[in-house]
């Protein structure tokens, strides 16, 4: 179970506002985080940028099998894992793994999911059990999000867990009955 990766493509992207941008549920109450007046770095930094959309982060493509109990998808699904530091797009190297190429002296930026898509998946079950049809929510694109000192530890922790899909053994965040669970329309992927 878990990540069944036979493909791990890394591409540098500059996130833009798409048709269905969706902030992570736990961040939706902070409406001002992406505004220009809250973005960028202190004026003394030589590379000042006003807009978070000028920042870029890495999209890692992973393939995995979807499971439901003993049943597994006939084919793997491909989704993104949002990875790495965020920095001004013009400074972001194309090669991966060049160490600490840029360090902001001001606020921290994290690479987090931006848009999601839903995909219908057919699961095959052992022992002659009927196949199951399920839908999964997959990360479709990533974006840079500015963190400030006002973010508490739990939110920082959530950024870390947003970057990877919940695994068996780790409690995923359910949306059940959560006021923060406001779901923007998902991209239709099938």
């Amino acid at each position: 179970q878990g990540w069944q990766a036979f493909k791990n493509d890394a591409t540098e992207i500059i996130p833009e506002l798409g048709e269905y941008p969706e902030p992570p549920p736990e961040l939706e109450n902070n409406k001002t985080m992406n505004r220009a007046e809250n973005g960028g770095r202190p004026p003394h930094h030589p590379f000042e940028t006003k807009d978070v959309s000028e920042y870029s982060c890495r999209e890692l493509h992973f393939t995995r099998y979807v499971t439901d109990g003993p049943c597994r998808s006939a084919k793997p699904v491909t989704e993104l894992v949002c990875s790495g530091q965020c920095g001004p797009a013009r400074l972001l190297p194309n090669a991966i793994g060049r160490g600490k190429w840029w360090r902001p002296s001001g606020p921290d930026f994290r690479c987090i999911p931006d848009r999601y898509r839903a995909q219908r998946v057919q699961l095959l079950c052992p022992g002659g059990e009927a196949p199951r049809a399920r839908k999964v929510r997959l990360v479709a694109s990533c974006k840079c999000k500015r963190l400030t000192r006002f973010h508490n530890q739990s939110e920082l922790k959530d950024f870390g867990t947003e970057a990877a899909r919940p695994q068996k053994g780790r409690k995923p965040r359910p949306r059940a009955r959560s006021a923060k669970a406001n779901q923007a329309e998902l991209e239709n992927a099938y």
Epitope: Q1, A118, P166, R175, Q183, L186, N188
Partner: antibody
Framework: EVQLRQSGADLVKPGASVKLSCTAS????????IHWVKQRPEQGLEWIGR????????TYVPKFQGKATITADTSSNTAYLQLRSLTSEDTAIYYC???????????????WGQGTSVTVSS | EIVLTQSPALMAASPGEKVTITCSVS???????LHWSQQKSGTSPKLWIY???NLASGVPVRFSGSGSGTSYSLTISSMEAEDAATYYC????????FGSGTKLELK
Amino acid sequence: EVQLRQSGADLVKPGASVKLSCTASGFNIKDYYIHWVKQRPEQGLEWIGRIDPDNGESTYVPKFQGKATITADTSSNTAYLQLRSLTSEDTAIYYCGREGLDYGDYYAVDYWGQGTSVTVSS
Amino acid sequence: EIVLTQSPALMAASPGEKVTITCSVSSSISSSNLHWSQQKSGTSPKLWIYGTSNLASGVPVRFSGSGSGTSYSLTISSMEAEDAATYYCQQWTTTYTFGSGTKLELK
């Protein structure tokens, strides 16, 4: 906020049909399965079936095959349950629910509508 | 069809008391397919525990769930007045089936 808003209570005559609606807000029904459940007075919950609004494909419990028809209109973000040839046995509260998407290989109905009461009486 | 049998059907507990509700499944299922809902009189059900042991958002930590195969349970470590409700176990494999419910009252 994710919400499922169901149509109001219905009083119908035996033999008639009724069509209940379930309008979603805060999410696109095309991306989820919508389930319908029946609860008779002072009794438990009984699954009727579900629909994939994206392609209109529906699944039913054998007991409700022929009795219930589940449809959806994605343009209005609404799912429907039609019940035909009503008898007193169909007097119940009917709930629609959304099957939550995959969060670590768990699938369950994570949001329910407020329910629609159907009373079959002459 | 998978049949879920809950026991007891009705029980009363005093504040602070430990409560355990059991759910027996007619044939073995994966623990990820067993869920619990809470329903209070006149309201719709609420997902309470999913995948046997994961608390849904907003559920107090005094609730817990456990089990595997054909035997599952929901436990309240210390009963509180707001916990009085009917609890249903449910399984979602190829069909959704519910237990008959356990009505928990405050003593």
